[in-house]
Amino acid sequence: DAEFRHDSGYEVHHQKLVFFAEDVGSNKGAIIGLMVGGVV
């Protein structure tokens, strides 16, 4: 297994293997509808 920053969910995207599901600690809003960062 190659190790990437994102820790789950492989997806072939533009012929490149990338991780899809991201850690809940991600600050990018990978989880649909989950409030992230300091936004109020």
Epitope: D7, G9, F20, G29, I32, V39
Partner: antibody, heavy 112, light 111 residues
């Protein structure tokens, strides 16, 4: 008030294209991924894809790879989803989502 | 695609009583990192959906603690300890182990 405001309902003929906008109000849209989903009439939710406004990187569900194009204009805090080659089966309410905020939904009706 | 299957599709409930919704995935959502990539959303009538539960058992901000979720790798349950009138709507389970897919929805209505 922080919110995502989507453009209004659209009626299109089969084969046409439509571009739906999603503007961040009191919200810096470039900070977080923008997800797009759709809800077919009386049906469940389908994830179309997402865009990272920081670098324009996109990921699509395979069935939408040739149907949807996601873009962001960071200068106006607006995300866009363009749908091409519309068919009656594309009639749905389309939602944008970023962080904990959802747009109100845009009804796209495809009818001749 | 990972297929998410919910039951029942309709669930008439009595206010003050408990209620539960089941969801099954066609593939285990438990990753080797110990996280389970299962989510619950609620769409109230006339509203956009909202996130209730993320990564199987974490309550989203502002969600009342009468909601809870549990499960294994493929079988999951959303429980409402005491249903309130404001809980009516369509509940969806979803996964993002591989992209995002949603269940067909369970409509919860007051008896």
């Amino acid at each position: 008030q922080v919110q995502l405001v989507q453009s209004g309902a659209e009626v299109k003929e089969p084969g046409a294209s439509v571009k739906v906008s999603c503007k961040g109000s009191g919200f810096n849209i470039k900070t977080y991924y923008v997800h797009w989903l759709r809800q077919l009439p009386e049906k469940g939710l389908e994830w179309i894809g997402r865009i990272d406004p920081e670098n324009g990187e996109t990921i699509y569900t395979p069935k939408f790879q040739d149907k949807a194009t996601l873009t962001v204009d960071t200068s106006t805090d607006t995300a866009y989803m363009e749908l091409s080659s519309l068919r009656s089966e594309d009639t749905a309410v389309y939602y944008c989502v970023s962080s904990g905020y959802w747009g109100q939904g845009t009804l796209v009706t495809v009818s001749s | 695609d990972i297929v998410m299957t919910q039951s029942p599709l309709s669930n008439p409930v009595t206010p003050g009583e408990p209620a539960s919704i089941s969801c099954r995935s066609s593939k285990s959502l438990l990753h080797r990192n110990g996280k389970t990539y299962l989510y619950w959303y609620l769409q109230k009538p006339g509203q956009s959906p909202q996130l209730l539960i993320y990564q199987m058992d974490n309550l989203a901000s502002g969600v009342p603690d009468r909601f809870s979720s549990s499960g294994s790798g493929t079988d999951f349950t959303l429980k409402i300890s005491r249903v309130e009138a404001e809980d009516v709507g369509v509940y969806y389970c979803a996964q993002n182990l591989e992209l995002w897919t949603f269940g067909q929805g369970t409509k919860v209505e007051i008896k």
